[in-house]
Interface confidence: medium
């Protein structure tokens, strides 16, 4: 409530960014070249879902994993290649609905 | 050899004020992620906070006790690493560790590899 | 914040023996975890990363397991350096956080 003699106004409902409580973090071997890969995937994410937490880290020789909230829901060392796009921001769309999140198999070869 | 030195520790009354520094040698500092951590007398390590590489956006992120009253900054000129403590109370007097909390190179993956010695701050009347 | 609970507190052992500090989570952290080592006086240094990745130099009588929200420290055969106070702490979070350490004293 407010100072005595002063009226409260109550504030507008804040507004919630998309993707608000999705925690990333993608592991990456830099010396392989796969900062492009991840900077890509991760601009699209950020467009797509302004509020989401995405963090990079150095992984070992031929790394690219991700993670959401957690979850490992794609590795480059089974599945072969990258993700696609489509595929990563449809699994942000499922974490941030609350929804079961399954492994992406789907993969594309680096460009 | 990568080197992180401490400064700036003393004696100092509740509700004053104190920076400490931290040089950091060996690495390329500005690709570097740095952190604080400190260790009250007799007790375990704490977390204090943390500032990001400038290309990672400079951010920062702190620990809940000392979020409002300390301020993190770097100057990647002077390869160093600051901690602008203010409304110091008894509690936060310990010894203050600045550490490596994720380096941009393949030599340095994850944690806090790299450590300085430790500056000692006492807080007392 | 995330919390990190450490134990047993104390832990008293022989050289040789084998000994388990266990360390968990209030939430899942995947496998960003670490330990270190840390001896009077002196800064802590990391032994393990990631669960369960030895860090450059450390013997390999270290051992470190565990994801999601329990994680183990293990030692084998016991060496007289080894009596010291170990962490773990956790780096999922923005907010790092350390367990409240165990220390593993001579018996």
């Known amino acids: 409530s407010g100072e005595p003699g002063q009226t409260s106004v109550a504030p507008p409902p804040e507004e919630v960014e998309p993707g608000s409580g999705v925690r990333i973090v993608v592991e990456y071997c830099e010396p392989c070249g796969f900062e492009a890969t991840y900077l890509e995937l991760a601009s699209a994410v950020k467009e797509q879902y302004p509020g989401i937490e995405i963090e990079s880290r150095l992984g070992g020789t031929g790394a690219f994993e991700i993670e959401i909230n957690g979850q490992l829901v794609f590795s480059k060392l089974e599945n072969g290649g990258f993700p696609y796009e489509k595929d990563l921001i449809e699994a942000i769309r499922r974490a941030s609905n609350g929804e079961t999140l399954e492994k992406i198999t789907n993969s594309r070869p680096p460009c | 050899e990568v080197q992180l030195v401490e400064s700036g520790g003393g004696l100092v009354k509740p509700g004053g004020s104190l920076r400490l520094s931290c040089e950091v040698s060996g690495i390329t500092f500005s690709n570097a992620w740095m952190s604080w951590v400190r260790q009250a007398p007799g007790k375990g390590l704490e977390w204090v906070g943390r500032i990001k590489s400038k290309t990672d956006g400079g951010t920062t992120d702190y620990a809940a006790p000392v979020k409002g009253r300390f301020t993190i900054s770097r100057d990647d000129s002077k390869n160093t690493l600051y901690l602008q403590m203010n409304s110091l109370k008894t509690e936060d007097t310990a010894v203050y560790y600045c550490?490596?909390?994720?380096?941009?190179?393949?030599?340095?993956?994850?944690?806090?590899?790299?450590w300085g010695q430790g500056t000692t701050v006492t807080v007392s009347s | 914040d995330i919390q990190m609970t450490q134990s047993p507190a104390t832990l008293s052992a022989s050289v040789g023996d084998r000994v388990t500090i266990t360390c968990r989570a209030s939430q899942s952290i995947s496998r960003w975890l670490a330990w270190y080592q840390q001896k009077p006086g002196q800064a802590p240094k990391v032994l393990i990363y990631k669960a369960s990745t030895l860090q450059s130099g450390v013997p390999s009588r270290f051992s470190g397991s565990g994801s999601g929200t329990e994680f183990s420290l293990t030692i084998n055969s016991l060496q007289p350096d080894d009596f010291a106070t170990y962490y773990c702490q956790q780096y999922y979070s923005y907010l790092r956080t350390f367990g409240q350490g165990t220390k593993l004293e001579i018996k």
């Open positions: 550490s490596i909390g994720y380096y941009y190179d393949s030599s340095f993956k994850y944690g806090m590899d790299v």
